[in-house]
């Protein structure tokens, strides 16, 4: 659940990921079909460049919906390509 | 404690190669991304390229596409940039960039010179 989740990040709070909260994050991600709003949020809380540690592939599949999550601050240090797949997805959301 | 240090610049004459190299020190285990960026005196950083945590995809600017290539060890957190057909306007400092989940580190730089 995602209470498990937040409490799994919680004991991890201010280290960086290591392998195993890293597999349990992608489990439970693809456990929920995809990167939901609730997850991202999440996950922003306690890894504020956490979009910007993925790949622009990694990143088409996150829905526009979940952008809804995202604060400017999380993606300052994305770099150009990561932003060239987040941006049209937080216009469609706006547009939305 | 992660530290990050590039090596390998120097003075090349333009048409030439030059390999930089960006070692990591410290626990950065997992879904690191890193790039290069660079500097020219009294301009803002300029991202050059990227190699991603997943599948090892790469993204490059358009000045550098073609000509540079990225590449990464991870076993040894290590990563490179192969810098072909170099130019003048190639001149600057290279910075790696190694962003995690939780944080961003910077190396110190590495001059790169092209010149005749």
């Known amino acids: 659940s995602l209470e498990t989740l937040k409490a799994l990040l919680e004991v991890n709070k201010g280290h960086e990921m290591s392998p195993q909260v890293a597999t349990l994050i992608d489990r439970f991600v693809k456990g929920r079909g995809q990167l939901d709003k609730d997850t991202l949020d999440t996950l922003t809380a306690f890894y504020p460049g956490y979009l910007c540690s993925l790949s622009p592939e990694e990143l088409s599949s996150v829905p526009p919906s979940s952008i809804w999550a995202v604060r400017p601050q999380d993606l300052d240090t994305c770099d150009p390509r990561q932003l060239d797949v987040l941006y049209p997805k937080a216009r469609l959301a706006f547009q939305n | 404690e992660v530290q990050v240090v590039e090596s390998g610049g120097g003075l090349v004459q333009p048409g030439g190669s030059l390999r930089l190299s960006c070692g990591v020190s410290?626990?950065?285990?997992?879904?690191?991304?890193m790039r290069w960026y660079r500097q020219t005196p009294g301009n803002q950083r300029e991202w050059v390229a990227s190699?991603?945590?997943?599948?090892?995809?790469?993204g490059y600017a358009d000045s550098v596409k073609g000509r540079f290539i990225i590449s990464r060890d991870s076993a040894k957190n290590m990563m490179s940039l192969q810098m072909n057909s170099l130019k003048s306007e190639d001149t600057a400092v290279y910075y790696c960039?190694?962003?995690?989940?939780?944080?961003?580190?910077w190396g110190q730089g590495t001059q790169v010179t092209v010149s005749s």
């Open positions: 960039n190694v962003q995690t989940p939780l944080n961003v580190y």
């Open positions: 410290g626990s950065i285990l997992a879904l690191n991304t």
């Open positions: 190699i991603y945590s997943s599948g090892g995809s790469t």
